[in-house]
Structure formats: structure tokens, C-alpha cells
């Protein structure tokens, strides 16, 4: 039960995280015009990974895409790449984890297969989260570096525009969304990896074999000893039916008076 909860929670947390990474990547407020110590302007600039926007006091917002690839700073390209890789890995991880969820039955998929898928998706989420955190951190570092540059016509524009020294940029909302989303995806991935350990079937010290009596059935006597069929006193081991063709959860493996060997 705890394993199912951990896996489910890991999936939900990762889902929220990846949605956040997608939102952050699409947002225009990666950097916003710094208004501190500046004259109060009736025009306000903010920039994203894909376009730069100007908002007027009138409410009019005009956005222009960066219609160049070669003209963009390498760091911006790197941030874009990190965020996209994070999204792609996260999306694949989500797809894999859906099939790995314990509460979803798909054909006769073994627990070991589900465990492997859970681990795979967990690792994908961890890498996805790290990509997002790295991307946002690289951009934040770029902003901090540019903020303190005092060259008269410093290059801070993401779209190849020359900005004057009075236009400085500070952290936008997308950075905080990205950091939180990346963290959530990372946590979700760790939870999936933890859940994987609980899903993996425990190895027993021996092969337990079930025999089917040809002429008669031997029943368990309530409160009495079990017929000698190779089982020891450790009833916590997984019970194997039909020569080990199918394993059941621990809770289901305890014998009752209606079980037959």
C-alpha cells in the first residue's frame, strides 16, 4: 500500500513539475526590466526565451519573436536546449510511469517489469528536473552578469538589440516557476525510484514448488500444522501457485483455511 502511494504521489508531483517546466519555458517573463533606482516609466520591457515584450501603461502589450538563430547569444540557445531536453525527458518519463503505475493493470505485466519502468521513469524525472534547474540557473547567472555590466551600450537584449545602460534586467516570474517546477520533478523522480525498490520482487533463498495431488486434495487444518509440502515456517515469503507462474502481493500471500495446495 505504501509503495502504491509513494509511486502515485511521485507520479503526481512529477506531472505538476513537468507542467511547470513547460509553463516556464513558454512564459515571456524570464527577465523583467529593473525599475529600482530608475525613473518610473510608462513603458515596461520583459523578455522570454522566444520573444521580447513591451507593456505600456495603456495596457497595450507588443511582443516580438527572436526571428534569428545565429544572432542569439549561445547561453540563450543553451538554456532553450536544456529546457526542451527537460520537457522531452519528462514527457517520456510520464508516458513510461503511466504504464508502471501499480494501480493500472495492463495484461499480465510482471511486477519486475513495473519496477524497471518505475525506475526508468524516476531517473528520467530526475534528469528532467536537473535540466530545468540548470537551464533556469544559467539564465539567472546571465542576468546577474549583465546587471552589473556598466558598458555604455551593453548587450543585454535577447533579440540582438543593443540596450542602453539605463535598461537593466532582473529575475522574472518564469525563473521562480522553473526552479520550483524543476525541484518538484526532481522530488517526483526520487519518489519513483524509492517506489521501485518496494515494487521489485524479493529474492527467496530457495525455490518453492507447489505440487498438485493427483487423487486428492490436502487441506490446511485451521490452527494445525501444514501438510509437508516443502514450505518452512516463514509464511511471509511469496506463495507460488502453478509452479511459480504468478506472484501476488504480500497481503494476499497469507494462507487462509480456504486455500488449497
Amino acid at each position: 500500500m505504501a509503495v502504491t502511494a509513494c509511486q502515485g504521489l511521485g507520479f503526481v508531483v512529477s506531472l505538476i513539475g513537468i507542467a511547470g517546466i513547460i509553463a516556464a519555458t513558454c512564459m515571456d517573463q524570464w527577465s523583467t526590466q529593473d525599475l529600482y533606482n530608475n525613473p518610473v516609466t510608462a513603458v515596461f520591457n520583459y523578455q522570454g526565451l522566444w520573444r521580447s515584450c513591451v507593456r505600456e501603461s495603456s495596457g497595450f502589450t507588443e511582443c516580438r519573436g527572436y526571428f534569428t538563430l545565429l544572432g542569439l547569444p549561445a547561453m540563450l540557445q543553451a538554456v532553450r536546449a536544456l529546457m526542451i531536453v527537460g520537457i522531452v525527458l519528462g514527457a517520456i518519463g510520464l508516458l513510461v510511469s503511466i504504464f508502471a503505475l501499480k494501480c493500472i493493470r495492463i495484461g499480465s505485466m510482471e511486477d519486475s517489469a513495473k519496477a524497471n519502468m518505475t525506475l526508468t521513469s524516476g531517473i528520467m524525472f530526475i534528469v528532467s528536473g536537473l535540466c530545468a534547474i540548470a537551464g533556469v540557473s544559467v539564465f539567472a547567472n546571465m542576468l546577474v552578469t549583465n546587471f552589473w555590466m556598466s558598458t555604455a551600450n551593453m548587450y543585454t537584449g535577447m533579440g540582438g538589440m543593443v540596450q542602453t545602460v539605463q535598461t537593466r534586467y532582473t529575475f522574472g516570474a518564469a525563473l521562480f516557476v522553473g526552479w520550483v517546477a524543476g525541484g518538484l520533478t526532481l522530488i517526483g523522480g526520487v519518489m519513483m525510484c524509492i517506489a521501485c525498490r518496494g515494487l521489485a520482487p524479493e529474492e527467496t533463498n530457495y525455490k518453492a514448488v507447489s505440487y498438485h495431488a493427483s487423487g486428492h486434495s490436502v487441506a490446511y487444518k485451521p490452527g494445525g500444522f501444514k501438510a509437508s509440502t516443502g514450505f518452512g515456517s516463514n509464511t511471509k515469503n511469496k506463495k507460488i501457485y502453478d509452479g511459480g507462474a504468478r506472484t501476488e502481493d504480500e497481503v494476499q500471500s497469507y494462507p487462509s483455511k480456504h486455500d488449497y495446495v
Partner: antibody, heavy 118, light 113 residues
């Protein structure tokens, strides 16, 4: 069409208060800010401040804080300019204007003459 | 505050002639974010509210005759009336829309010679 209709002329004594109204029609009132501009007799235009009915934000020019209060009532699409403790130098025509894209004043009220005289 | 200086204070031009009004701002009105100049021109006739002619320094407001044109960038701007008509007699104001407080020029009175 877009219209800004202001209240009629006012004759007030020094120390009194006055409230000038500006009723907007022909557009969604909350979508655009209303600015107030003063024009003293024979003088140029002086920006007083503006209100953003959408965000509730108000900005005043330096000489227009304290005695001057900008407000609005969304239900009747009306902006107000209240001046308290009137002085003789407050005698002027007060205009309201809509702030439109390009930060331009595209529509103006007809103006309200406020005369302060003892 | 941004100081807007208009010149000349008054201008007498013959009908059909070109009228040119200058406006200088104490700081650049060119916004690097969108490469637009936040300057507007208004016309005010006696007893009337101002009327918008030009915004973004050179964009003509709809319904404004094409004899009115705006030019300039940064700190220096010009309003040109290519062929003065009798109905153009008015006071013309420039206004910066970049910094608060928004400020107007002192005005230029255009008359017929």
C-alpha cells in the same frame, strides 16, 4: 462611439471642495486608464495623474498629491477628480482623457471649468 | 521630470505654405525594447479640448489629414504641416509618454500670415 462627458462648470470659494466627474461610454471602462490634465487660463497643458480602473492603481504628478484625489466607480463607468481646500490658483479647466495604445490620449472630455473666487 | 521644450512659441505661415514645429526633450524618448519613440502631438483650438494628431512620434491618428506628419527620434522631434489650411490655426503641443510624470511642451501657436 467613444465619449467622455464631464460635469458642468463650478464656482467655489477658497477652502471649499469640488468633485469633477468624467463619464465614459462607447468602450469597456475598466480596460483603459483615465488621465486628468489641467489647463490654467491662457496657459499650457499640465498632466495631473491617472487611474487604472482595472488594477486600482493611481499615479499622481508631484504637484498634485494631498489635496487631489482620483477615484472611479466602475458600475457607472465614471472617473472622479476631487480637489479639497481649494485655492485661487486651482482656477483652471480640468480635462479627463483616455489613455490608449501608444500611451496616447486618444479621447478627451470637453473640460470642466473650476473657478475659485471669494 | 522630463522637460519638453517647444520652438517657436508662435508661428505665422501663409495659407498653403509649410509650417514646422520643433520639440526637444531633456531625455531620450526612444524605447529600446520596441524601437518606438514615445512622443505625441496634440492640436488645441480655442474653447476645445486637445485633439490627438500623432503618436509614437510619426504615426498619424486615424482621421487626421495627411498634411500632418511627425518625424524625429531620441530627443529631437518635428511636427510638419505640409500645406497650412485655415482650420489648422491652433496651439500645438508635444507630449512625452515615456516617463512619469507625463509632460507637455509649452505649446506653439500657429497663425495665418
Amino acid at each position: 462611439q467613444i465619449q467622455l462627458v464631464q460635469s458642468g462648470s463650478e464656482l467655489k470659494k477658497p477652502g471649499a471642495s469640488v468633485k469633477v466627474s468624467c463619464k465614459a461610454s462607447g468602450y469597456t471602462f475598466t480596460n483603459y486608464g483615465i488621465n486628468w490634465v489641467r489647463q490654467a487660463p491662457g496657459q499650457g497643458l499640465e498632466w495631473m495623474g491617472w487611474i487604472n480602473p482595472n488594477t486600482g492603481e493611481t499615479t499622481y504628478a508631484e504637484g498634485f498629491t494631498g489635496r487631489f484625489v482620483l477615484s472611479w466607480d466602475t458600475s457607472v463607468s465614471t472617473a472622479y477628480l476631487q480637489i479639497s481646500s481649494l485655492k485661487a490658483e486651482d482656477t483652471a479647466v480640468y480635462f479627463c482623457a483616455r489613455l490608449y495604445y501608444g500611451n496616447r490620449f486618444d479621447s478627451w472630455g470637453q473640460g470642466t471649468l473650476v473657478t475659485v473666487s471669494s | 521630470d522630463i522637460v519638453m521644450t517647444q520652438s517657436p512659441d508662435s508661428l505665422a505661415v501663409s495659407l498653403g505654405e509649410r509650417a514646422t514645429i520643433n520639440c526637444k526633450s531633456s531625455q531620450s524618448l526612444l524605447y529600446s525594447g520596441n524601437q518606438r519613440n514615445y512622443l505625441a502631438w496634440y492640436q488645441q483650438k480655442p474653447g476645445q479640448p486637445p485633439k490627438l494628431l500623432i503618436y509614437w512620434a510619426s504615426t498619424r491618428e486615424s482621421g487626421v489629414p495627411d498634411r500632418f506628419s511627425g518625424s524625429g527620434s531620441g530627443t529631437d522631434f518635428t511636427l510638419t504641416i505640409s500645406s497650412l489650411q485655415a482650420e489648422d490655426v491652433a496651439v500645438y503641443y508635444c507630449q512625452q509618454a515615456y516617463y512619469y510624470p507625463l509632460t507637455f511642451g509649452g505649446g506653439t501657436k500657429v497663425e495665418i500670415k
